[in-house]
Structures are given as C-alpha cells and as structure tokens.
Amino acid sequence: EVEKTACPSGKKAREIDESLIFYKKWELEACVDAALLATQMDRVNAIPFTYEQLDVLKHKLDELYPQGYPESVIQHLGYLFLKMSPEDIRKWNVTSLETLKALLEVNKGHEMSPQVATLIDRFVKGRGQLDKDTLDTLTAFYPGYLCSLSPEELSSVPPSSIWAVRPQDLDTCDPRQLDVLYPKARLAFQNMNGSEYFVKIQSFLGGAPTEDLKALSQQNVSMDLATFMKLRTDAVLPLTVAEVQKLLGPHVEGLKAEERHRPVRDWILRQRQDDLDTLGLGLQGGIPNGYLVLDLSMQEALS
C-alpha cells in the first residue's frame, strides 16, 4: 500500500507520457489521476515503466474500478495484464474477441498462466459455448488449449467449431477427451467424400468405436501406423485380420515393429495364429490352431 502524499508542485500529470518514467512510486500515486490513466490506457504500453511503477498504476485502476475494469480499459491493458491476478480477472466481463486477442498477444510466448486460464474461462462462459472464432483464436495462441479442457467442458463445443481444430491441437488429448470430440467431428465432416473425410477425421480417431473403424476399412483409407497406435484398444480388439489389413493398406507391414505395444499386442492375442500368418509378417502370439475361443465379455455382461 503506497502512502497518500501530496503531489509536488508542477508535477501533476496532464497526460500519460514518457516523463512519468522518472517519477518515483509515491509521485506516480500522488500525481497521476486515475480517470486520466483510464482514458489514456492505450499509451501505457509504449512507455517503459518498471514492474514496480506498473504496480502503482494498477493500484490506481483498482481504486477507480473496485467492481472490475470496464472493457474499454481491459482492451488496452498491455503489459499491465501480466500484473493482474485471477481474482482481478474474475471481476471482468470480457465479451469482445478483439479484447481477448489483445490480452493473449501480450502473453504470447509465455507459459499458460492462471491469469490467462481465468481470462479464457470467463470469456468462454460469457459466450455460452466455445464457438469457431474463439477456438480459432485460442488454438492459434495455445495449440494445446483444447486438450487442457475436461470432457465436460468439451461437451459444450459445437460440431461447427471442429472445423477450426488442427491435428497438432489434439496432440496431448487423452482418450476420454477424444471420446467427446470424435462424435462431434463425425457430425461436422459427415458431408465430405471418402478420402477428404478421412483426412479430416484422422486426428480424432482415438475416440472412434469399432463399427466406425470397420466402416473405414471398407474405404481404402491406408491409415498410417501412428494413427492406428492411438486408437482405443477396446475398439481395435474386435477387428479381424482382414479388416486391419484393409484399414492399414500398405502400412500393414508396420505392425511387426509395434507387435509388443498396445493396441497391436492385445489385438494379436485375440487373433487366430492362422489368420495372422496370412499377413506374412511373422507376427507371433495368436491363438493356436484348434483352440476354442470363448467371448468372456459377453458372459460377464449376462451375469
């Protein structure tokens, strides 16, 4: 808390300009009118104030707007945004995408901070859903943003927003998140033809059920091994050797290198060795010929 002291004669600020960098903290407090600061916030970012001086300016704005800053001030916060706490930001009502962009620009290159997370949360909640323009903006600044959301939060993403998602935006998503996103992507891309559809849906396939993988196997998609390895194990297990061969096309040879890793390892254990041998890859660990295969999962479901 800065002491209240009278402004020295001749030092009262008439405008926000570079002369203020020479003011001590107490002089800034005493000589800068908060209302003047609020109307000339756009100038602050061009002036090399120290972090300590910015603390004083923030304090003045906090006194002027105890209930939270108006958007006209928020949009021009610049580096002062880095001084805001999540508690400060929770008082704001940010509705303009331009304001959001301006603040994310200030934070560009920084790690995702609690302040930014709070800002995004306030903005998205204010909009009611994560629309395409917002998602476009957020993933441009934070490619991992989508995967930082819980499955519950992802459920508010409308299918139309899925068009804004790039493959790299899903890199860190776990299966639970892809389970939510996949049906939305399927809906979003449903009117595309086979090969175009596969290009778009590919990065979401970690959430695809068995029946969709079976359908894809009939479309000559030539799925690469990296995508196959990200599929849900429970979705891959029921696929036949023939279906996996069709699904992977020329990439089927890559199974050999992955035979010790999930889901390939678990899938091999479910296939007849005879069927695996037809691939000519030397895959081992299938069910020996003459053995009876019992589907215990069906039995468990009935009991």
């Epitope: 570079e18 090399p48 120290t50 972090y51 880095l82 290159g109 920084h110 790690e111």
Partner: antibody, heavy 117, light 107 residues
C-alpha cells in the same frame, strides 16, 4: 546491499541435467521479477527465462523451451533453473538478474555450465 | 525476434575523448532500451534504461538518447575505468534481445 549468488554450474555430458540456484539478499525478493541470462563467446548475451514475483507468469526463450524450467522459493529467497536434455550449445556463463521490466538492474557473478562429452 | 545491431563493434579512444555508440533495432521499440557496461570476468552493470534514464550511482558523463529504432550511448569524457564492453538491450517485446557489444579500448 543487493546480492545475487549463483551456484550449481559445472561440466556435464550432453543429454544430462543440471540445476542452477541463485541466492538473493539485500532486497525484498518476493516483490521482484527475476530472470536468467546466459553469455557465450559466440552468441553473446541471451535472455533465457523470467518469472514473476508470485511465480505465476513465466517465459522461456525458444532455444530452451521444453528443456529448462524456472522456479522460485520466496520463503528461501531463491531462484532456480532446472536444465534438462543439455546440449553443447547450452555451454555458457549463466547469470541470474533482478528484472525491472525495461532492464535488469542487478546481476549475479555468473555460474559456468560446460556441456561436453 | 527483434534484432539489435550495435556499431561500431570496437572503438579505440583516449582518456578525455567523447565516445558515441549506436544501437539500431530491427523494428520500432519506443523507448524500451537499456545500456550495460561489462568488464572482463565480471557481470554486466546497468547504466541506463528507458533509453535515457540514468541509474543511480552512474556518473553523469554517461547519457542515452533515441526512440523508435535508433539509439545512442554517449560518454562525454572517457575515464580510465570506462574501458569495457557496452551492450544495448530491448525490452519492447519478448524475447528480450541484446546487441552484440561494442568494445571501448585504449588508443
């Protein structure tokens, strides 16, 4: 008077890790942003990372992003730099500095990190 | 990233000389510029920030000027203790970047 003392430097093999520490005294550490800056004969001075007074705002130079982690312990008046997956090009004298925003007003004496096989 | 270019890279001068070092930014940085002095085996020392704000304890023979892309550090009357390397640094945008340095040597 303000003092910053780095420690933890040394010779390390490529791919290994090292943790630098910076002990601060003579000022209210918890009120100040802090930075790590390194200096090499080839590239000169390079700003590596900074951390806000509370530790909530952090920035890394692209050259170290994903490998280095800056942190602070305000109760111990200490700043840290955890350096993983070290490369030959990380060889440098590492300085911790008090960060004013427009400038770095106090620097430590530096800690030499040599990455070599 | 903003590139900072200093000139000259070295300058030979005598005690009492007026020395001028320039620093050019690859894009406008308003007044977000600092100057440092470094002596061999020592850490850099802040002389000036905000293009012209002299730090306390720094002799008044040092002065800084400029705005936008072109900046100048002037030593009005060189003293024996001023022989060192001088660096400029921008803080207008992240990452902050330094000039390559100007070495002031004894003629």
């Amino acid at each position: 008077q303000v003092q910053l003392v780095e420690s933890g430097g040394g010779v390390v093999q490529p791919g290994r890790s090292l943790r630098l520490s910076c002990a601060a005294s003579g000022f209210t550490f918890s009120d100040h942003y802090m930075s790590w800056i390194r200096q090499t004969p080839g590239k000169g001075l390079e700003w590596v990372s900074y951390i806000s007074s509370s530790g909530s705002t952090i920035y890394y130079a692209d050259s170290v992003k994903g490998r280095f982690t800056i942190s602070r312990d305000n109760a111990k008046n200490s700043l840290y730099l955890q350096m993983n997956s070290l490369r030959a090009e990380d060889t440098a004298v590492y300085y911790c500095a008090r960060d004013l925003g427009p400038s770095f007003d106090y620097w430590g004496q530096g800690s030499l990190v040599t990455v070599s096989s | 990233d903003i590139q900072m270019t200093q000139s000259p890279s070295s300058v030979s001068a005598s005690v009492g000389d007026r020395v001028t070092i320039t620093c050019r930014a690859s894009q406008g940085i308003s007044s977000w510029l600092a100057w440092y002095q470094q002596k061999p085996g020592k850490a850099p020392k802040l002389l000036i920030d905000a293009a012209s704000r002299l730090q306390s304890g720094v002799p008044s023979r040092f002065s800084g000027s400029g705005s936008g892309t072109d900046f100048t550090l002037t030593i009005s009357s060189l003293q024996p203790e001023d022989f060192a390397t001088y660096y400029c640094q921008q803080a207008n945008s992240f990452p902050r970047t330094f000039g390559q340095g100007t070495k002031v040597e004894i003629k």
